[in-house]
């Protein structure tokens, strides 16, 4: 017989709770872990069950993105018995068990943190052996990356009527401030954030036209730090050369 | 493209077998609970068997236990139904079906496959 | 083993109606219901999971809530595309077990 809980509450401490007369489950996660790009973060997750000294198989999941459903990140799986909890995945091979699932933790350590890890997490434990249980945090921890401004992708593009563009793309968290100097702009230019489309980290400003030859630069600043890069654009017979 | 896709279904007289195969592609397959639903002409859906990431543990139905044999062979993302003992009411649609979850249960089937027709007859 | 019940075992609307079909389990199950539409000669698709998860790329219309015995699976306004068959399954504990069906047929 396969019996399963599953949590049904939750407070402003993402304490997770299912409770019923001599059993309950539940899971403590914070809400949100914050940590810096290329550092380690932990998410903590303890939990309590209704099977009192449990022995048997175990396995902790890490997912990401949403519960249930979204992809593993982290999974390992102890024996009968064991504390060891042997890793079955950890992807990119930057994820750790901090905690001993034995003993009701099911904490994470997550190493050399970029933008794209910026996502909620979720754990979850199941028992199977004599018992068979799985619960899982519905609501998870939001990981929060900063990260100082880099600049991804500057460059001169040809425009209608022989004319020329600069394109400029930074990431960072906070989203970064882009500006622009160069000749005929003045000491700089700033121009309007435009975060694109599913890259929530990233943010383009273009110079629309280039009236002059000479270096153009792009300066990227949050409240991390600042970062900057050039295009010099020199037109021979209608072309244009460009470097960084 | 993620799929599952069954073979192995066919015409066979009580007592006889039949083995089912569910070839699985793009997802990692060894990371999921897969499962065997049936569906008996102009009838509902029937939970058949369950296996669990690794084959450590299986699960049956008490109309086919001791009869199927659930197994995996996660080196070739495959998954089978050995069938023994047919009955007539064993007549059906065998679909394979990936678990939404994990490993080891099925929080729900979230991926299946078209699905493979056993007539059991004389 | 838990007993899966559904109703109506069929309905009849039309499009731009607003469906409820429940499913009533013979004990608790907690929030581990899905429900799955099944057209003929096709496989079932997942819907809603975990009772009240709507399964990527299935339409904002359809939407699931319930926990315990009594679930409720919900369309908004139903479309030509909606008359099908649906199932609601527990994976509470096994042997999982389906509901008998709901036949959504056009008035």
């Known amino acids: 017989f396969v019996r399963t809980k599953i949590d049904t509450t939750e407070n402003l401490l993402n304490t997770e709770v299912h409770s019923s007369p001599a059993q309950r489950w539940s899971m403590q996660v914070p809400p949100e872990v914050s940590a810096e790009a290329g550092d380690a973060a932990v998410l903590p997750c303890t939990f309590t069950h209704p099977h009192r000294h449990y022995d048997g198989p175990l396995t902790a999941i890490w997912r990401a993105g949403e519960p249930y459903a979204g992809p593993q990140v982290f999974r390992c799986a102890a024996a009968r018995g064991s504390e060891l909890c042997q890793t079955a995945l950890s992807l990119h091979g930057r994820f750790r068990l901090l905690g001993n699932p034995r003993r009701n933790d099911l904490s994470l350590r997550v190493e050399r943190l970029a933008l794209a890890d910026d996502r909620r997490y979720f754990c979850r434990v199941e028992f199977a052996g004599d018992v068979h249980d799985r619960y899982e945090s519905r609501h998870g921890v939001r990981l929060h990356v900063t990260a100082a401004p880099r600049i991804v992708n500057i460059s001169v593009l040809p425009s209608p009527a022989h004319a020329f563009r600069a394109l400029c793309t930074a990431e960072g968290e906070p989203p970064p401030a882009l500006a622009w100097s160069g000749p005929a702009l003045g000491n700089s230019l700033a121009a309007v954030r435009s975060p694109r489309e599913g890259h929530g980290h990233l943010v383009t400003a273009e110079l629309p036209a280039l009236t002059h030859d000479g270096r153009y630069t792009c300066t990227a600043a949050n409240s991390l730090g600042r970062s900057e890069a050039s295009v010099y654009l020199f037109r021979f017979h209608g072309a244009s050369g460009a470097s960084t | 493209e993620v799929q599952l896709l069954e073979s192995g279904g066919g015409l066979v007289q009580p007592g006889g077998s039949l083995r089912l195969s569910c070839a699985a592609s793009g997802f990692t397959f060894s990371s999921y609970a897969m499962s065997w639903v049936r569906q008996a002409p102009g009838k509902g859906l029937e939970w058949v068997s369950t296996?669990?990431?690794?084959?450590?543990?299986?699960y049956y139905a008490d109309s086919v236990k001791g009869r199927f044999t659930i197994s995996r062979d996660n080196s070739k993302n495959t998954l089978y139904l050995q069938m023994n003992s047919l009955r007539a009411e064993d007549t059906a649609v065998y679909y394979c079906?990936?678990?939404?979850?994990?490993?080891?249960?099925?929080?729900?089937?979230?991926?299946w496959g078209q699905g493979t027709m056993v007539t059991v007859s004389s | 083993d838990i007993q899966m019940t559904q109703s109506p075992s069929s309905v009849s609307a039309s499009v731009g109606d607003r469906v409820t079909i429940t499913c009533r389990a013979s004990?608790?199950?907690?929030?581990?219901l899905a429900w799955y539409q099944q057209k003929p000669g096709k496989a079932p698709k997942l819907l809603i999971y975990?009772?009240?998860s709507l399964q990527s790329g299935v339409p904002s219309r359809f939407s699931g809530s319930g926990s315990g015995t009594d679930f409720t699976l919900t369309i908004s306004s139903l479309q030509p595309e909606d008359f099908a068959t649906y199932y609601c399954q527990q994976s509470y504990s096994i042997p999982y077990t389906f509901g008998q069906g709901t036949k959504l047929e056009i008035k």
């Open positions: 079906a990936k678990a939404i979850g994990s490993s080891w249960y099925s929080d729900a089937f979230d991926l």
């Open positions: 975990v009772a009240s």
């Open positions: 004990q608790d199950i907690s929030s581990w």
């Open positions: 296996i669990t990431g690794g084959g450590e543990s299986t």
